[in-house]
Amino acid sequence: MMTGTIETTGNISAEKGGSIILQCHLSSTTAQVTQVNWEQQDQLLAICNADLGWHISPSFKDRVAPGPGLGLTLQSLTVNDTGEYFCIYHTYPDGTYTGRIFLEVLESSVAEHGARFQIP
């Protein structure tokens, strides 16, 4: 039975040209995290494997940095980066947990972070 929940940074706004940290946290489970995948819609951005460490997809190597922790840092943001980002926790024995963050990249300087919220 899957008892865990994923807390994410929720809705995030950031300025064009800036950087942002995407973070998820898995709680309320004793399951072992074997791998975390970060995806943008249907594109794989990065993998953090418990044994093998980080792998960044070649097409994102220039703008994506691993960490902090199991999070992901996106740099040199463009308006085209607006959209959904998913953290997919592969765990044993629970299975897969998915968290979601919506990133809004703004032209202006009014960007500010959204509140943290629970993924149902």
């Epitope: 809705n11 959904e84 998913f86 979601r100 919506f102 809004e104 959204g114």
Partner: nanobody, 125 residues
């Protein structure tokens, strides 16, 4: 309980157009993120288009970009999918989905709370 009712499907020749509508029963529709999905026989359900509550951000599946347009009318609690230059590959049952208190758009079916019964779109060659 939110009721979603799709309409506008039918049989059309390749290159033709259809406009799908999805009417919601809920008055708080303006806070819903909405999506259009489709499922062809023997295939998995896939997202076609998705829209945030304000209508500012819209996602399109790559294969429909430039051909399909999703829009919403919050005053009428309705979303639309204008489908132009239809292809036989577009043949499927099209479903409308709603997520209450949406943040941005949602492209994965597991994040939606309510679904319509679907409307069939058949494109003949």
């Amino acid at each position: 309980q939110v009721q979603l009712v799709e309409s506008g499907g039918g049989l059309v020749q390749a290159g033709g157009s259809l406009r799908l509508s999805c009417a919601a029963s809920e008055r708080t529709f303006s806070s819903f993120a909405m999506g259009w999905f489709r499922q062809a026989p023997g295939k998995e359900r896939e997202v076609v288009a998705a829209i945030d509550p304000s209508g500012r951000y819209i996602y399109y599946k790559d294969s429909v970009k430039g051909r399909f347009t999703m829009s919403r009318d919050n005053a009428k609690s309705t979303v639309y999918l204008q489908m132009n230059s239809l292809k036989p590959d577009d043949t499927a049952r099209y479903y409308c989905a709603a997520r209450i208190r949406g943040e941005g758009y949602y492209t994965r079916s597991s994040f939606y709370h309510y679904w319509g019964q679907g409307t069939q779109v058949t494109v003949s060659s």
